[in-house]
């Protein structure tokens, strides 16, 4: 007959390494009589016999975890007791080993240049995986701007254009390596104008090309504004190369204007814009007339029919293909602008414009246009249209353009010949002579220039009837 024997654990439990989803087995060999009752604990909590995740065999001496999970990590103990002496216990650790796994992979990112970008890469694994990053085909080197955080995420301070590209994170431990999918880091750059349009001073009827170059990511679009409104005429040519957009606005110049190039690109729901402006001013019409070729002919148009002297010969500029049609179209455009001016100014301005665009002509061997006399020009500017003229000059200085006289091909009075110097060298405006006889009072006007610049012009107030200084007879 066997003697009772207290349990002795002959094979103590050892640390077991197991991979997730694999089988892990603890063996607890016990010698005793009578046969012991063996129970198992995990982290001091009893493992129930009916728990289907475990298999307990060989009279309880073999504990098998059928499919290891990362949560099975812990201290496993077997306790043997047969009522003889005390219960005995042996414990061992289960270390769940895990190939690297990327639990939060990076995603595509669009970021504006200069901001901070963070590409996430959260990993699991045992041993803890080390995380590195690849950009394109090369390992990414950390520097003062680029760092891999403890969490595995990639942080880029002050993002630059050259940071754009394809990235992936790599998680590595002794059991293997995991790669994330390739993600794209797109660096967006606010629209910026590289080359602003240049201002031009040209003669009437010239072609001018305004050029504006802009850069940005995405490539900006360029639009043109003329005097605060969308450009109504001219042709726009665009080309894009290496994220640079080049826009050329070709204009046929019939009026001065402020042209603004606006470069715009979109960043999510927001837009960035950059602007640059140039002015196109019209060189002295009479000067361009002198320098240009042309011919003398009777005016046969409609717009200036009531203003110009009957049967007078006027100068037509052959820098236009159809000079008579072209000059008529110019005056027609100017006429529409005059709708905005006062009833006092309008007829005087019409007289000035018609005689300026259709200058009296001396046939001769070389047809020569005859400009308006300075005194008549100043009368329109300083008396009839003083308010409009001052408003126009103020707006021009501030770069503001609205409807009214600023778009008109008005002469620069100071550059015109004086009738007092040579009465035959310039043209008088009969309308103003008529008004001189019929109008007795004028509103007070402060001269926009010192009176020294204005021959025969009173300093502040003027009345044709009263002031002989404004002599036009």
């Amino acid at each position: 007959e066997k003697l009772p024997k207290a349990p002795v654990i002959t094979t103590p439990l050892e640390t077991v390494d197991a991979l997730v989803e694999e089988v892990a087995t603890f063996m607890c060999a016990v010698e005793s009589y009578p046969q012991p009752e063996i129970s198992w604990t995990r982290n001091k909590i009893l493992i129930k016999l009916f728990d289907t995740r475990y298999s307990i065999r060989e009279n309880g001496q073999l504990l098998t975890i059928l499919s290891v999970e990362d949560s099975d990590d812990g201290i496993y103990c077997c306790i043997a007791n047969n009522g003889v002496g005390g219960a005995v216990e042996s414990c061992g650790a289960l270390q769940v080993k895990m190939k690297p796994k990327i639990t939060r992979p990076p995603i595509n990112v669009k970021i504006i240049e200069g901001l901070k970008a963070v590409l996430p890469c959260t990993t699991m694994g045992n041993p803890k995986p080390s995380v590195s990053w690849i950009k394109g085909d090369n390992a990414l080197r950390e520097n003062s701007r680029i760092a891999v955080l403890e969490s595995g995420s990639l942080r880029i301070h002050n993002v630059q254009k050259e940071d754009a590209g394809q990235y992936r994170c790599v998680a590595k431990n002794s059991l293997g390596t995991a790669y994330s999918k390739l993600v794209k880091l797109e660096v967006e750059v606010f629209a910026r104008i590289l080359r602003a349009p240049e201002s031009h001073n040209v003669t009437f009827g010239s072609f001018v090309t305004l050029r504006c170059t802009a850069i940005g990511i995405p490539v900006p679009t360029i639009s043109w504004i003329e005097n605060g409104n969308a450009v109504s005429s001219g042709s726009i040519q665009e080309s894009v190369k290496d994220r640079v957009i080049d826009s050329r606005l070709q204009l046929f110049i019939t009026k001065p204007g402020l042209y603004t190039c606006i470069a715009t690109n979109k960043h999510g729901e927001k837009f960035s814009t950059a602007k640059a402006a140039a002015t196109v001013s019209i060189a002295e019409w009479s000067k361009s007339q002198k320098d240009s070729q042309g011919y003398c002919a009777q005016y046969r148009g409609e717009v200036c029919d009531a203003v110009l002297a009957k049967d007078a010969l006027v100068f037509f500029n052959t820098s236009y293909r159809d000079p008579e049609d072209a000059q008529e179209l110019l005056i027609h455009t100017a006429w529409n602008e005059l709708k905005a001016v006062s009833p006092l100014c309008r007829p005087a301005a019409e007289a000035l414009l018609c005689n300026h665009l259709f200058q009296e002509c001396s046939p001769g061997v070389v047809p020569t246009p005859m400009p308006i006399c300075r005194e008549y020009c100043l009368a329109v500017k300083e008396l009839f249209c003083a308010k409009e003229w001052q408003a126009m000059e103020g707006k021009a200085h501030r770069g503001l353009y609205r409807s009214g006289m600023h778009l008109l091909p008005v002469p620069e009075c100071s550059k015109l010949p004086s009738m007092h110097r040579d009465p035959t060298a310039c043209t008088r405006l009969p309308y103003l002579d008529y008004k001189k006889e019929n109008i007795t009072t004028f509103p007070s006007i402060t001269s926009s220039r010192p009176s020294a610049d204005i021959p025969n012009l009173p300093a502040s107030t003027s009345s044709f009837a009263v002031s002989p200084a404004y002599s036009m007879t």
Epitope: G205, F207, F252, S292, Q293, R300, G301, E302, T318, S319, Y320, R321, D322, P323, E324, D325, A326, E328, L329, H332, T333
Partner: antibody, heavy 119, light 112 residues
Framework: EVQLVESGGGLVQPGGSLRLSCAAS????????LNWVRQAPGKGLEWVSY????????DYADSVKGRFTISRDNAKNSLYLQMNSLRDEDTAVYYC????????????WGQGTLVTVSS | DIVMTQSPLSLPVTPGEPASISCRSS???????????LDWYLQKPGQSPQLLIY???NRASGVPDRFSGSGSGTDFTLKINRVEAEDVGVYYC?????????FGQGTKLEIK
Amino acid sequence: EVQLVESGGGLVQPGGSLRLSCAASGFTFSSYRLNWVRQAPGKGLEWVSYISSSTGSLDYADSVKGRFTISRDNAKNSLYLQMNSLRDEDTAVYYCARRSPYTGSLDNWGQGTLVTVSS
Amino acid sequence: DIVMTQSPLSLPVTPGEPASISCRSSQSLLHSNGYNYLDWYLQKPGQSPQLLIYLGSNRASGVPDRFSGSGSGTDFTLKINRVEAEDVGVYYCMQALQTPYTFGQGTKLEIK
């Protein structure tokens, strides 16, 4: 937007007459020189006639002189081509075209109207 | 009358390749004002002609920059630096120097 719309084309017998119209919009009609240009089926373009804006001057291709008359009504923004003594060789699509007084180019064209002269 | 002569009359081109059309006038189109009164027009299939180039070398509004015009006096060239499928049609040169305004015979550009 500049628009030119021709009308009045159709089938006519040799020796017959037809009047084409061109309705214009979107620009200062009275300030532009207007032209008629035609294109015989499968052939190239042939200038027919022009009428100026301000001067009322006009001209014709030799092939239509004395038979065709160009006119305009600035109040109605309309251009016309009266075609008399029509011949087989006048069969063509007739286009109305606006001429830029600055550059001389035909910068806007209508869609055309087909004139067929046949017995 | 000024006679305009275009060559070639037919021009098969592979998309992306350049194309060049020549236009010769029987007398100089250079006006005393310094401008060459030579225009280029394109007539796409089933459409009206449209202005491409005016005064010899100026692109009209909305014309892509792959089109360019050059030349002076009696010899002019229209170049397309990279032909696209939408460029097919008949190209005409026209002199606007004097009446009667005259056109070239036309060059038919087609895609190979």
